[in-house]
């Protein structure tokens, strides 16, 4: 059979091989598309409701004056000339849509380096068969799955077209010390050979890169944390971070009630003051980080306090960027 | 310290073409990209398009796309803006800009003292 | 193309007064920037990703907002916060920058 792609809507002319170039003529044309059962025969004489979606011509060729995706399938001519020599036609129909150039939309215009972000999703809308997307990084194809790239489409299909609308997300993981301004496109490549790629514009997100907050300092007085009843203990956290970040406390894991401040004094301690303390620096452009915690003890008259405090782990580090 | 060195006055006829310059220093020129932005007189700020040094790629707000074509010279740290097809229009203060990307986010993070642009026959 | 509108177009504030700047934009962008400019000289980097202080701003200045809507406040308004006050935002879908139309602040 021959391959035939047409495009949907145009019209289509199939020759019918061997016929009299014109009546009279013994040929006729079978059919076996989306809008047959099994085999339609269609001769010379047409008629009927068939003329509008396909008629026999004159010459024996048959004319479909707007191909739908319908008629897809195999069209077959069996024709007898004067002679009585019998000749066969055989066509494979396959139809195709080119859609409008693609389309990002919901482009991020920054992105963060090192986290996950979205950058923006492709659309392309009215294509047959589907065809797919693919994503382009300063020109070159990003591979989904790989390096921090991941990519969540979806196929729609319009329920009276018939034809396909394609959405794809991409989701990239900046790499630290990376371009600064990386070009994404996205590209439509059809679904049948032959016909070439429709691009988007590029987009252009800014990338930074927060910086990695100092680690916070939490300087207790008395060095140790260990005081005698009633005494007082200065808990002072220390942030190198410009600008300076809200200081929040917390008393065995859980946040102390407290306006933020970057000191916070027990006075006249009590039982109810032992615990280990914290404080949690929080930048507007990063998230929270933790300092060292410290054990805060009251210590008996006659007692040794310890040497150099009862120090707990290293906190929580970050909890989470931007 | 990052400076951007721009000349102060550039008085130029109708319907004639002016190159602005803008020479940086205090930083690895090619690691940034540069901008360009109009302020006519007593107005607000429009911005003109942006340079990456380093490989000379351009965005160019689509209004002046005809009228500014931008350039770098490496060698001498230097951005450059043509402007054509003067008129009245074009009478304005031109200022370069550096790109603040990095550890600070800001769009526009130095901005040179900006030439002022008369166009008068 | 996304417009930024800024109001109002011209204000006065008396010193010690609360001051709240506005730029709205015609469709959601992610984050804003503003820059202050006094007369003569170039503008400069105030406020960016719509709520962090550039270098050496005053802490009483604040930015905050999302989507359409945004603002910079004054907490306590002084003689020498008296400038012009321009909102900027990115769209990277093509590249371009766009700046409101600016807010003229005098001292009263």
């Known amino acids: 059979a021959q391959n035939i792609t047409a495009r949907i809507g145009e019209p289509l002319v199939l020759k019918c091989k061997g016929a009299p170039k014109k009546p009279p003529q013994r040929l006729e044309w079978k059919l076996n598309t989306g809008r047959t059962e099994a085999w339609k025969v269609l001769s010379p004489q047409g008629g009927g409701p068939w003329d509008s979606v396909a008629r026999v011509l004159p010459n024996g060729s048959l004319f479909l004056p707007a191909v739908g995706i319908q008629d897809e399938g195999i069209f077959r001519c069996q024709a007898m000339n004067r002679n009585g020599k019998e000749t066969k036609s055989n066509y494979r129909v396959r139809v195709y849509q080119i859609p409008g150039k693609p389309e990002i939309v919901d482009s991020a215009s920054e992105l963060t380096a090192g986290v996950p972000n979205k950058v923006g999703t492709c659309v392309s809308e009215g294509s047959y068969p589907a065809g797919t997307l693919s994503w382009h990084l300063d020109g070159k194809p990003l591979v989904p799955n790989e390096k921090g790239v991941s990519v969540k489409e979806q196929t729609r299909r319009h329920p009276e077209t018939g034809l396909f609308t394609l959405q794809s997300e991409l989701m990239v993981t900046p790499a630290r010390g990376g371009d600064p301004r990386p070009t994404f496109s996205c590209s439509f490549s059809p679904g049948l050979p032959r016909h070439r790629a429709l691009r988007t514009a590029p987009i252009q997100p800014r990338v930074w890169e927060p910086v990695p907050l100092e680690e916070v300092q939490l300087v207790v007085e008395p060095e140790g944390g260990a005081v005698a009843p009633g005494g007082t203990v200065t808990l002072t956290c220390e942030v190198p971070a410009q600008p300076s970040p809200q200081i929040h406390w917390m008393k065995d894991g859980v946040p102390l009630p407290l306006p933020p401040s970057p000191v916070l004094i027990l006075p006249e301690i009590g039982p109810q003051d032992q615990g280990t303390y914290s404080c949690v620096a929080t930048h507007s452009s990063h998230g929270p980080q933790e300092s060292r915690a410290v054990s805060i003890s009251i210590i008996e008259p006659g007692e040794e306090g310890p040497t150099a405090g009862s120090v707990g782990g290293s906190g929580l580090g970050t909890l989470a960027l931007a | 310290q990052v400076q951007l060195q721009q000349p102060g006055a550039e008085l130029v006829k109708p319907g004639a073409s002016v190159r602005l310059s803008c020479k940086a220093s205090?930083?690895?020129?090619?690691?940034?990209?540069m901008h360009w932005v109009k302020q006519r007189p007593g107005q607000g700020l429009e911005w003109i398009g942006e340079?990456?040094?380093?490989?000379?790629?351009?965005n160019y707000n689509e209004k002046f796309k005809s009228k500014a074509t931008l350039t770098v010279d490496k060698s001498s740290s230097t951005a450059y803006m043509q402007l054509s097809s003067l008129t009245s229009e074009d009478s304005a203060v031109y200022y370069c800009?550096?790109?603040?990307?990095?550890?600070?986010?800001?769009?526009?993070?130095?901005w040179g003292q900006g030439t002022s642009v008369t166009v008068s026959s | 193309q996304i417009v930024l509108t800024q109001s109002p177009a011209i204000m006065s504030a008396s010193p010690g007064e609360k001051v709240t700047i506005s730029c709205s934009a015609s469709?959601?962008?992610?984050?804003m920037y503003w820059y202050q400019q006094k007369p003569g000289s170039s503008p400069k980097p105030w406020i960016y990703?719509?709520?962090n202080l550039a270098s050496g701003v005053p802490a009483r200045f604040s930015g905050s907002g999302s989507g359409t809507s945004y603002s910079l406040t004054i907490s306590s308004m002084e003689a020498e916060d008296a400038a012009t006050y321009y909102c900027?935002?990115?769209?990277?879908?093509?590249?371009?920058?766009?700046f409101g139309g600016g807010t003229k602040l005098e001292i009263k």
């Open positions: 900027q935002q990115y769209h990277s879908y093509p590249p371009m920058y766009t």
């Open positions: 340079i990456n040094p380093s490989n000379g790629r351009t």
């Open positions: 469709s959601s962008v992610s984050y």
């Open positions: 205090g930083y690895t020129f090619t690691s940034y990209w």
């Open positions: 990703r719509t709520s």
């Open positions: 800009a550096r790109d603040g990307l990095g550890y600070r986010p800001i769009a526009m993070d130095y």
